[in-house]
Amino acid sequence: EQAPGTAPCSRGSSWSADLDKCMDCASCRARPASDFCLGCAAAPPAPFRL
């Protein structure tokens, strides 16, 4: 996990200022309001399970 301002997060992840670490973009399907989802250049999340 990288500190902000250094190397970017690995492919498929994005920096979360709230959690102070890289987070999986895949989790934006479940939690689209997460701060790091703004940095995820994926297609709009599919409808979630609940």
Partner: antibody
């Protein structure tokens, strides 16, 4: 480092109650969803219940087999969460694990605590 | 509920060879971008440990000998080359919907 420390468990008679606790440290507890997962030789690993974060209105979800019997709750101010189990039956016997997830996979796990329901 | 079927139930692999474990979901657990399938390793007396998330993403600290693949309903965990320390039971789990369900496990023995 991340730790999930469990307490509770033991021997309880059929129809009895038990409360399990899990205290978290080393991560931003309030942002994570918390679950209980149990394991038995008969049913393997079985997700039991989940409580989401404040931003998700502390929504709770339960496996069909425990709906109306088990209640999951959390106390973000003390980084702990609980499983209240009522009307216990023999099929509830197993090892109970607390676990955290941001959304999908079970990242951190407690050490497990044994529950035996028997007369 | 989505049923997760793991095969084989057990296998014995020689040291340094490849172990392949399969997991089939009763319905698709993938979008066009991600697969909501995860793999765990469990040793006796310990809780499960996350190995692979989202079908193919290696968890931090897990050796590159472990790899995952698949999409839709069919997924595979590969371990190559296997080491003595890999003796354990391996489980798949989906997070497509509630209830989250696990496979029945595959017990790996190193010969």
């Amino acid at each position: 480092q991340v730790q999930l420390q469990q307490s509770g468990g033991g021997l309880v008679q059929p129809g009895g109650s038990m409360k399990l606790s899990c205290i978290a440290s080393g991560f931003t507890f309030s942002s994570y969803w918390m679950s209980w997962v149990r394991q038995s030789p008969e049913k393997g690993l079985e997700w039991v219940a989940e409580i989401r974060s404040k931003s998700d209105n502390y929504a709770t979800h339960y496996a069909e087999s425990v709906k109306g019997k088990f209640t999951i709750s959390r106390d973000d101010s003390k980084s702990r969460f609980f499983l209240q189990m009522n009307n216990l039956r023999a099929e509830d016997t197993g090892i109970y694990y607390c676990s955290s997830t941001y959304a999908d996979y079970f990242h951190y796990w407690g050490q497990g605590t044994d529950l035996t329901v028997s007369s | 509920d989505i049923v997760m079927t793991q095969t084989p139930a057990s296998l014995a692999v020689s040291l340094g060879q490849r172990a392949t474990i399969s997991c089939r979901a009763s319905q698709s657990v993938s979008t066009s971008t991600y697969s909501y399938m995860h793999w765990y390793q469990q040793k006796p007396g310990q809780p499960p440990k996350l190995l692979i998330k989202y079908a193919s993403s290696l968890e931090s600290g897990v050796p590159a000998r472990f790899s995952g693949s698949g999409s839709g309903t069919d997924f595979t965990l590969n371990i190559h080359p296997v080491e003595e320390d890999d003796t354990a039971t391996y489980y798949c789990q989906h997070s497509w919907e509630i209830p989250y369900t696990f496979g029945g496990g595959t017990k790996l023995e190193i010969k």
